[in-house]
Amino acid sequence: REVLVPEGPLYRVAGTAVSISCNVTGYEGPAQQNFEWFLYRPEAPDTALGIVSTKDTQFSYAVFKSRVVAGEVQVQRLQGDAVVLKIARLQAQDAGIYECHTPSTDTRYLGSYSGKVELRVLPDVLQVSAAPPGPRGRQAPTSPPRMTVHEGQELALGCLARTSTQKHTHLAVSFGRSVPEAPVGRSTLQEVVGIRSDLAVEAGAPYAERLAAGELRLGKEGTDRYRMVVGGAQAGDAGTYHCTAAEWIQDPDGSWAQIAEKRAVLAHVDVQTLSSQLAVTVGPGERRIGPGEPLELLCNVSGALPPAGRHAAYSVGWEMAPAGAPGPGRLVAQLDTEGVGSLGPGYEGRHIAMEKVASRTYRLRLEAARPGDAGTYRCLAKAYVRGSGTRLREAASARSRPLPVHVREEGVVLEAVAWLAGGTVYRGETASLLCNISVRGGPPGLRLAASWWVERPEDGELSSVPAQLVGGVGQDGVAELGVRPGGGPVSVELVGPRSHRLRLHSLGPEDEGVYHCAPSAWVQHADYSWYQAGSARSGPVTVYPYMHALDT
């Protein structure tokens, strides 16, 4: 028979729990063996004090009786031949030599019937407290402090953990978070990050990714100061933060045992989310302007927002929806997170400026408004946060209320009358088509353009192919030639201030078709851009190249 207990001496700390195992091998008799625990105190090394037994409930000496009855000291059977002695809260007088004895069930008295191990009780000298983390976040002078950090900003917390235990021990320090107002315990405390006794850094499951990405850091500064930094605070980082220090010692058998643990509340942390703060307003109110006049709109981004920089960035854009159109419409202009301005589709080539005029105020200026600029304008602001990497993450966006903009129409009315000079044309001749344009209204300096179009018959029917441009004269007086069905020469010209002519030289059968004239009125603004103020379409003019009698 052999009774086995751990190799000693064992060092444990007053006030903590201790477990000492005992098992028996090589015995005869029933599988379920009985165990008795005794203590030999240093001041009376020959006196065995009965602690607890698996067989006799009245076994305990007076010094242990009350603690056994209270369940603070107990023997727990693991199996028939193994038990563990558990002492919930060690006292200094619990130091001494512990003996595990197994009453004999053997036919012959052979081997050892007890095993001894020394337990030394160390004073509780582990200290844990909050340390000022440095100038990060706003801290209210309460205990524990309340801290408010902006989403995306750094959250830094410090912890002081030290021990003056005379033996060689190691400290493991971890930072944990519990949801605000929740009771703190192992089940409610979620580990954020910890530094093990071997100085390895480990993160709790939800934080492992952030640790790997460098967004979460934990370091030891000096002998007893630990600092945790959460790179880009997120809404889910709010809560009560704790620091837990655990003291570990290496037992003679080589295994490590935790001999003390203490926890301190570091801070109640509130994360001010950008989505709860970001607000966008526009001004001035509803605008009514004339064509060619400048349109200026202001956008103000407000809220308790972190400044643009290392942790946060902003983009601001203007959207325009034509009156009655659903959705955000189209993008007019945007200043991106790097301050680069861009004009949206349809606005390139126009004199439009989008600029930051104050720390949170942005201006959109259209140098010369057009009727097509009328609609509902909104300012859209987006807030981005950056972790400790360079990656930006969109954290919030807000749109202003709609701002109606009205641009008066020019009131230009065009009419066009077109005809074929001479009425009848023959193959090989030149067909002259004339277009007279009448204009009512419009500003001074109105320019006219006119283009000529043809629809060709296919098998005697007008084709479903859209009309083709034959040629025209732009508002700048420059002629543009399209495609002539017959492929011969074409000339377009202005023959009077309101009169345009199209000539088709050397007519062929392919030139047969229905032609029309399409005038348009153009206004040039101060920024030299043009916009179309009106358009019209003449009635159809049929061109049928007849054959001369000689052609038959």
Epitope: G344, E348, G349, R393
Partner: antibody, heavy 120, light 108 residues
């Protein structure tokens, strides 16, 4: 009508050269950054090169750098792509495209494309 | 280079059904500089969406774009016969501009 029309494609031997042209009409050509995008048979789209409004700020995909040159003539409303040292993998339909906000908002007008075949 | 991964590769749906196409970037797309194109067989691409969520001129409102950061979505609320085509996403957050591999929307 806003329009882009490519030309200049054809069959060329490996190591040979081609010059593609793209004629623009219906818009103020000089107000836009322009790009060339290609599509190999049965494959996806690949951006090839881009050029700034005044002809500066040229950029190229790594696959064509040093072999292709993009240029433009704003007086003729025309974009060009000079392709030298052509390889079999350059076989594709080449599209000319108008970029919005220097391409930050994509390309809103595309030509019908011109086919370049590099084969011996 | 930013890699754009489109999924699924092929989407088999019937006219009238809703189509959801995904585009995932290998790194964050700043300022939502992402566009979507439609390409019908034998035709040039056509811009549908720019700035991740703005419809290009003349694009029907059954097309909508959403997303930010690395995950973007093109939704066609009710497929019309002419919507069966290949769809590409494209980024211009970083040089060079890159396209996704495309999603083919075919008739079931």
């Amino acid at each position: 009508e806003v329009q882009l029309v490519e030309s200049g494609g054809g069959l060329v031997q490996p190591g040979g050269s081609l010059r593609l042209s793209c004629a623009a009409s219906g818009f103020t050509f000089s107000s836009y950054r322009m790009s060339w995008v290609r599509q190999a048979p049965g494959k996806g789209l690949e951006w090839v090169s881009g050029i700034g409004r005044s002809g500066g700020r040229t950029r190229y995909a790594d696959s064509v750098k040093g072999r292709f040159t993009i240029s433009r003539d704003n007086s003729k409303n025309t974009l060009y792509l000079q392709m030298n040292s052509l390889r079999a993998e350059d076989t594709a339909v080449y599209y000319c495209a108008r970029a919005i906000a220097a391409g930050r908002y994509g390309m809103d007008v595309w030509g019908k494309g011109t086919t370049v075949t590099v084969s011996s | 280079d930013i890699m754009l991964t489109q999924s699924p590769g092929t989407l088999s749906l019937s006219p009238g059904e809703r189509a959801t196409l995904s585009c995932r970037a290998s790194q964050s797309i700043r300022n939502n500089y992402l566009a979507w194109y439609q390409q019908r067989p034998g035709q040039a691409p056509r811009l549908l969406i720019y700035g991740a969520s703005y419809r290009a001129t003349g694009i029907p409102d059954r097309f909508s774009g959403s997303g930010s950061g690395t995950d973007f979505t093109l939704t066609i609320s009710s497929l019309e016969p002419e919507d069966f085509a290949v769809y590409y996403c494209q980024q211009r957050s970083n040089w060079p501009p890159t396209f996704g591999g495309g999603t083919k929307v075919e008739i079931k």
